[in-house]
Interface confidence: medium
């Protein structure tokens, strides 16, 4: 058992439920709706040229005022539109991005893990996790704003599996689980009931979770602990 | 007059085609080249502002290792004697943990296990020698002239080493790198 | 009710092979690592095997290890013991046991008897 | 593997008297202990985890503590019930070892 004295400061703040996980947001659901997007752009250019061979008969033998070339024309420039928009924010996204990495103070290599490269190198990968595994003491809504901040969420344990090896790797930590009285269910950051044994439960002041050397307690909420963030890849 | 604007429109119409069509194919390149960037640059960035690494060889570890700097990691929780711990570490293609500093493994800084390492002496070099024959450097624990030669070593990731019988069980580490 | 029965015990001679099963029920058994322990008669409890929940993690005694086989169906809430080559010292109840998320054995089933003898 | 060594082997005691079992490891293993309850012809029961932590449900007489090397099991007063063997448990690490046991009797 981590024997480290756990510090307790007099502000105890209370978890806020109501705080909304940030997604971080990848390339790939750009990537993906530009590829819709010209699925799109397929189909109705398509189409446009079905409309026009299929009229063009009618309209030249009547000799009749251009309104389907008009309707063609505007199909097809917004579809120019569409597709030089595209174009646009394909080159220019990147280039951003990168400018602004350029412009960090923080320089942080990427390592490539299971599908090669998802976490910074100073964080660790593990059975499809990013884990960021800190060695500052925060409060629990500390640690929480401080994972948000990494685009992460703190801690969550999904099974007993990754629970083991966390506690190989750090015998102690907070993690996402909170309740907002001892007579409230234990919560998920996500808001699903928490299943698991957590130990110490009947101590009313004690309403967020710290993982302890493959052990799940409670602890006070404004006591310094160190804190771990995670993401799925 | 309408058979001049209907040529009109048709022109202005097959202009507008020709450059859907070539900003389709535009489009459809950078596409490719994007894919092709996504499995090298992360889709996830844990942070607001990281510097991506495009071009690293470091990638994928076995299921139950752990990545960490471009090296893989298998971190034991069942103990086995140093030879057995070497068997098979490399029976998974990977040797004892060889360290390069005392922070390789950083991340591992709070546990309070130890863990046989790639370490043992060498009669015929009367030095301590890394599993793939290079000499333990003086600085990286500053207690080794202590050790016992007849024992294996095994380290605390917080940067103890100690000397034991290598037929005493301990957890291990075996590791990989990838670049 | 968390509950535990192991079946398939008995008689065997030297060499022969045995398949324990446990039924598990009253808890989410996927959730879980689960054991085997065995105790010779009038002796002390020895572990012999363990699984995880997923059985990504297995592990085994010294004792057993080449011989024994843990495997679980998740799906039919039930962990088995192959044992092969059974020899006299293999004698003994055995039972199984659940963790909870890396606690020691809070649950155990009744035990089964298992006898090698010629 | 990590050796646990459990004293007494057996000791006997009368209800209301207060009795004490050590059990110590060959190598340290911070707190993960556990103290087990077995009666004849009977499963193992959880008494004590972490070292020093009761399961829920199993009476305040009995009390848990120690760390590294060296744990105690405590019964502050015997009752009848309480007479059966006890057993330490090691879940540091694998392979998971137990003491060979301490008999209580009543004297």
């Known amino acids: 058992m981590d024997n480290q004295g756990v510090i307790y400061s007099d502000l105890n703040l209370p978890p806020n439920p109501k705080r909304q996980q940030r997604k971080p947001k990848g390339n790939k659901n750009s990537i993906l709706a530009t590829e819709q997007e010209i699925t799109y752009a397929e189909l109705n250019l398509q189409k446009a040229s079905q409309d026009f061979q299929g009229n063009d008969k009618t309209y030249h033998c009547k000799d009749l005022p251009s309104a389907p070339e008009k309707l063609i024309v505007g199909i097809l420039g917004i579809i120019c539109l569409i597709l030089m928009a595209s174009v646009v924010t394909i080159v220019v996204i990147p280039s951003t991005l990168i400018q602004r990495h350029n412009n960090s103070s923080l320089n942080t290599r990427t390592q490539k893990a299971r599908h090669c490269g998802h976490c910074p190198e100073e964080w660790i990968t593990y059975s499809n996790s990013c884990y960021y595994i800190g060695k500052e003491r925060r409060t629990w809504e500390e640690s929480l704003l401080a994972c948000t901040s990494k685009n992460s969420s703190l801690l969550s344990i999904d099974n007993e599996e990754e629970m083991k090896f966390l506690s190989i790797i750090s015998p102690s930590s907070w993690i996402g689980v909170f309740r907002n009285s001892s007579h409230h269910p234990w919560v998920t950051m996500n808001g699903l009931a928490f299943k698991h044994e957590i130990k110490d439960s009947d101590n009313a002041e004690l309403n967020c979770a710290v993982l302890q050397v493959n052990r799940l307690k409670s602890a006070q909420c404004g006591s310094s602990i160190i804190y771990h963030c995670k993401h799925k890849l | 007059m309408a058979v001049f604007k209907t040529t009109l429109w048709r022109l202005i119409s097959g202009t507008l085609g020709i450059i859907c069509l070539s900003l389709m194919s535009t489009l459809g390149i950078l596409l490719k080249n994007s894919f092709t960037k996504l499995s090298i640059e992360p889709a996830f960035t844990p942070g607001p502002n990281i510097e991506l690494q495009k071009d690293s060889d470091c990638c994928s570890c076995q299921e139950k290792w752990v990545g960490y700097r471009c090296n893989c990691y298998f971190i034991s929780s069942e103990q086995k004697t140093w030879n057995e711990s070497r068997h098979l570490c490399a029976s998974q293609k990977s040797s004892l943990l060889q360290l390069q500093n005392t922070d390789e493994l950083d991340f591992m800084s709070s546990s309070q296990q130890f863990y046989w390492i790639g370490l043992s002496y060498s009669e015929e070099h009367t030095a301590w020698l890394w599993e793939n024959g290079s000499a333990l450097s003086q600085y990286l624990f500053p207690s080794f002239e202590t050790f016992n030669t007849k024992n294996c070593i095994a380290y605390n990731p917080n940067g103890n080493a100690l000397d034991e019988s290598c037929e005493d069980k301990n957890r291990y580490i075996c590791k990989q790198q990838l670049i | 009710e968390v509950q535990l029965v192991e079946s398939g015990g008995g008689l065997v001679k030297p060499g022969g092979s045995l398949r324990l099963s446990c039924a598990a029920s009253g808890f989410t058994f996927s959730s879980h690592s689960m054991n085997w322990v065995r105790q010779a008669p009038g002796k002390g409890l020895e572990w012999v095997s363990a699984?995880?929940?997923?059985?990504?993690?297995?592990y085994y005694a010294d004792s057993v290890k080449g011989r024994f086989t843990i495997s679980r169906d998740n799906a039919k809430n039930s962990l088995y013991l192959q044992m092969n080559s059974l020899r006299a010292e293999d004698t003994a109840v055995y039972y199984c046991?659940?963790?909870?998320?890396?606690?020691?054995?809070?649950?155990w089933g009744q035990g089964i008897l298992v006898t090698v003898s010629s | 593997a990590i050796q646990l060594t459990q004293s007494p082997s057996s000791l006997s005691a009368s209800v209301g008297d207060r009795v004490t079992i050590t059990c110590r490891a060959s190598?340290?293993?911070?707190?993960?202990l556990a103290w087990y309850q077995q009666k004849p012809g009977k499963a193992p029961k959880l008494l004590i985890y972490d070292a020093s932590s009761l399961k829920s449900g199993v009476p305040s007489r009995f009390s848990g503590s120690g760390s590294g090397t060296d744990f105690t099991l405590t019964i502050s007063s015997l009752q009848p019930e309480d007479f059966a063997t006890y057993y330490c448990q090691q879940f540091n690490s694998y392979p998971l070892t137990f003491g060979q046991g301490t008999r209580l009797e009543i004297k």
């Open positions: 190598q340290g293993i911070p707190s993960a």
């Open positions: 699984i995880s929940s997923s059985s990504s993690y297995i």
């Open positions: 046991a659940r963790e909870e998320w890396g606690l020691p054995f809070d649950y």
